[in-house]
C-alpha cells in the first residue's frame, strides 16, 4: 500500500522537511502532491510526469517546494502555515490512481525567553511575587529553574498560565534566587538570564559585640552592633536611655566607672519600616571579670579520728578575691573544731572527727565572678582498740 | 557529486558514423533525462532532443531526424548519441545535459568535439 | 517554434559596473495555470560548457552568487549583473523551455572594458 511519511515529523521553522514515499507502484503516468488530505486543483503543489521526467508547479507551490523523481517531496524553508496534511496522487498506466496522505508539524525556534517580575523588591512574609516568563508562545512547554534545581514542592510556589507564570507566596529572604524560566517545543529549547529576587527584610534582633560585659577603667569600650536586614538597617546607639550617635560601632577611649550602664542598640529599615533594640549592660572595674579556678591542698588526705588535725589551703593569684569553704554542700564552718585563718585561705580542723571525712572544696569570688576549685577527699580512719574481756593472764 | 564525462574529440570523414558517449555518476541515472545540445564553431547553441532514462524513449528535434540516433545502456549509466552520413556541416561540438526536476539542463558534460573533413 | 532574440550581442562593461542583457521571446512563456515563466538563464565560459544560472525567470540555482539576478514578463526578459567580476567574462544564453522544441537566444558576449 501506497504510503508517506515526514522526515521529520516536527521541523523546526526554516528548516527543511521531506515528504518520502514508500510502495510506490510500477507502472506509472506521474503523480501529485496536494496540500490538504484530499485531491484539489487549486491546491496543487507540483505534478511529476514519467513521460517528460520533469516536474511542473501548481497553483499551491510557493517555490519552496522539490519533488524528486521517486515521488518524494522536499519543502525548504518551512513556516508554520506550511503545518498539516499533504495528500499524494499517483497516476498509474492503467488510469487507476492511488492516494496516501502525510503530516508535519511546524515549530517555532524558540527564542530566548526573559522574565518579567511584578515586584522586584518584595517585603519578607508579606509580599507575593508572581514572575511571567516571556514571551507566550504556542505548543511551547513553560519550565522553572531555582539556583539550577527545578522546582522543590512547596506551598509557597505555585504554577498558573501554563506553567508560564511562577508565584512565590510570602516571600522569604532565602527566596532570592536565580531564577530561570526555559521555553521547550518538539524541536528546541532555551533557558532565560537569570533573574534574582531582591527581598526586603528585618532587620532581626541586632546583636553586640564583643560579647564582654565587664572592662577596667582606663580601657578602650568599642562596641559593634549588627541586624540582618535588607536594605542594611541604620543604627543608632543610647546610653541609660539618652541617644549618643547615629552609627553601627561606638567607641569610647579611657573609660572610667562612670560609663558602667545600659547600652542600647537601636535597628530601623526604612523600606520595611521596621525596628529592632538590643539592651547590654557594661559595668566598669577594677574587679577581675573572670575569677581563675583556685587550688586546695590538704596537709594530709587521711587521718587518724580524734587525734590528728589537718589544714586546707585554697590558693589563687587573683587580687580583690574572698574565699569560701564547703563541705558536703554546706557552708564551712560548721564546728568548733574548724578555724579559718589567713583572710579565708587557710581551713584548720582539730581534731578530725569521723563525722568530718568526705568531699572540700572552696570557692573564691568578687562581686562580679567566681569560680571552685575542685574537690578533695578526707578520709578519716581509727586505730583498732585493745581487746578489754575482763580476764588477767593467768 | 553529479557528473556527466564524454568521451573524447573525433575527426571522422564525411559519410562516415561517429558515437558519442555520455557516462553519468553521482545520481540515480533513470531519474533524470538526458538531453543533447550543439555547438557549431563559433555559434551558438542549438536543442538536438532528450532521451528518457526511464523508458528509453527519444524524443528529437526537427532538423535532428534520421541520421541521429539517441541511446541508453542504464547497466553502466551511459547515454550515446549516434550520428551517422557525417556532413561537413555535423562539425560542432556537442553536449550532454541532464534535465533538471523543473526541466533547464542543470548539470552538463564537458563536450565532445566531432570534426568532419575529407 | 519559439524564436528567442537576444540583445546585444556583446557587451563592455568595467569592472564593477552592472551588466544588463535582454531575451524576448517571439510569444510568451507564461504559464497561466501556476504562474511560472518557463524561461532559463546559462553562462557559458571560454571552452567550457554552459552552466545554469537562473530558472522561472528569476530563481538562482543552488551556488550561483546573488549579482546575478533575473527578471521579466511573459515575453521580455533581463538578467543582470549587479557588479562585474573578472570571472563574470561569458556567452549568456536564454532557454524557454515552455514548448517543444526548447530554445535558445543566439547570446550575448559580456568582456570587460
Known amino acids: 500500500q501506497l504510503t508517506t511519511e515526514s522526515m521529520p515529523f516536527n521541523v523546526a521553522e526554516g528548516k527543511e522537511v521531506l515528504l518520502l514515499v514508500h510502495n510506490l507502484p510500477q507502472q506509472l503516468f506521474g503523480y501529485s502532491w496536494y496540500k490538504g488530505e484530499r485531491v484539489d486543483g487549486n491546491r496543487q503543489i507540483v505534478g511529476y510526469a514519467i513521460g517528460t521526467q520533469q516536474a511542473t508547479p501548481g497553483p499551491a507551490n510557493s517555490g519552496r517546494e522539490t519533488i524528486y523523481p521517486n515521488a518524494s517531496l522536499l519543502i525548504q524553508n518551512v513556516t508554520q502555515n506550511d503545518t498539516g496534511f499533504y495528500t499524494l496522487q499517483v497516476i498509474k498506466s492503467d488510469l487507476v490512481n492511488e492516494e496516501a496522505t502525510g503530516q508535519f508539524h511546524v515549530y517555532p525556534e524558540l527564542p530566548k525567553p526573559s522574565i518579567s517580575s511584578n515586584n522586584s523588591n518584595p517585603v519578607e512574609d508579606k509580599d507575593a511575587v508572581a514572575f511571567t516568563c516571556e514571551p507566550e508562545t504556542q505548543d511551547t512547554t513553560y519550565l522553572w529553574w531555582i539556583n539550577n534545581q527545578s522546582l522543590p514542592v512547596s506551598p509557597r510556589l505555585q504554577l498558573s498560565n501554563g506553567n508560564r507564570t511562577l508565584t512565590l507566596l510570602s516571600v522569604t529572604r532565602n527566596d532570592t534566587g536565580p531564577y530561570e524560566c526555559e521555553i521547550q517545543n518538539p524541536v528546541s529549547a532555551n533557558r532565560s538570564d537569570p533573574v534574582t529576587l531582591n527581598v526586603t527584610y528585618g532587620p532581626d534582633t541586632p546583636t553586640i559585640s564583643p560579647s564582654d560585659t565587664y572592662y577596667r577603667p582606663g580601657a578602650n569600650l568599642s562596641l559593634s552592633c549588627y541586624a540582618a536586614s535588607n536594605p542594611p538597617a541604620q543604627y543608632s546607639w543610647l546610653i541609660n536611655g539618652t541617644f549618643q550617635q547615629s552609627t553601627q560601632e561606638l567607641f569610647i577611649p579611657n573609660i572610667t566607672v562612670n560609663n558602667s550602664g545600659s547600652y542600647t542598640c537601636h535597628a530601623n529599615n526604612s523600606v520595611t519600616g521596621c525596628n529592632r533594640t538590643t539592651v547590654k549592660t557594661i559595668i566598669v572595674t577594677e574587679l577581675s571579670p573572670v575569677v581563675a579556678k583556685p587550688q586546695i591542698k590538704a596537709s594530709k588526705t587521711t587521718v587518724t579520728g580524734d587525734k590528728d588535725s589537718v589544714n586546707l589551703t585554697c590558693s589563687t593569684n587573683d587580687t580583690g578575691i574572698s574565699i569560701r569553704w564547703f563541705f558536703k554542700n554546706q557552708s564551712l564552718p560548721s564546728s568548733e573544731r574548724m578555724k579559718l585563718s589567713q583572710g579565708n585561705t587557710t581551713l584548720s580542723i582539730n581534731p578530725v572527727k569521723r563525722e568530718d571525712a568526705g568531699t572540700y572544696w572552696c570557692e573564691v569570688f568578687n562581686p562580679i565572678s567566681k569560680n571552685q576549685s575542685d574537690p578533695i577527699m578526707l578520709n578519716v580512719n581509727y586505730n583498732a582498740l585493745p581487746q578489754e574481756n575482763g580476764l588477767s593472764p593467768g | 557529486q553529479v557528473q556527466l564525462v564524454q568521451s573524447g574529440s573525433e575527426l571522422k570523414k564525411p559519410g562516415a558514423s561517429v558515437k558519442v558517449s555520455c557516462k553519468a555518476s553521482?545520481?540515480?541515472?533513470?531519474?533524470?533525462?538526458v538531453n543533447w545540445v550543439r555547438q557549431a564553431p563559433g555559434q551558438g547553441l542549438e536543442w538536438m532532443g532528450w532521451?528518457?532514462?526511464?523508458?528509453?524513449?527519444?524524443t528529437y528535434v526537427q532538423g535532428f531526424t534520421g541520421r541521429f540516433v539517441f541511446s541508453l545502456d542504464t547497466s553502466v549509466t551511459t547515454a550515446y548519441l549516434h550520428i551517422s552520413s557525417l556532413k561537413a556541416e555535423d562539425t560542432a561540438v556537442y553536449f550532454c545535459?541532464?534535465?533538471?526536476?523543473?526541466?533547464?539542463?542543470?548539470?552538463w558534460g564537458q563536450g565532445t568535439l566531432v570534426t568532419v573533413s575529407s | 517554434d519559439i524564436v528567442m532574440t537576444q540583445s546585444p550581442d556583446s557587451l563592455a562593461v568595467s569592472l564593477g559596473e552592472r551588466a544588463t542583457i535582454n531575451c524576448k521571446s517571439s510569444q510568451s512563456v507564461l504559464y497561466s495555470s501556476n504562474n511560472r515563466l518557463y524561461l532559463a538563464w546559462y553562462q557559458q565560459r571560454p571552452g567550457q560548457p554552459p552552466k545554469l544560472l537562473i530558472y522561472w525567470a528569476s530563481t538562482r540555482e543552488s551556488g550561483v552568487p546573488d549579482r546575478f539576478s533575473g527578471s521579466g514578463s511573459g515575453t521580455d526578459f533581463t538578467l543582470t549583473i549587479s557588479s562585474l567580476q573578472a570571472e563574470d567574462v561569458a556567452v549568456y544564453y536564454c532557454q524557454q523551455y515552455y514548448s517543444n522544441p526548447w530554445t535558445f537566444g543566439g547570446g550575448t558576449k559580456v568582456e570587460i572594458k
Open positions: 532521451i528518457n532514462t526511464n523508458t528509453g524513449n527519444p
Open positions: 553521482g545520481y540515480t541515472f533513470t531519474n533524470y533525462g
Open positions: 545535459a541532464r534535465k533538471g526536476i523543473w526541466g533547464p539542463f542543470d548539470h
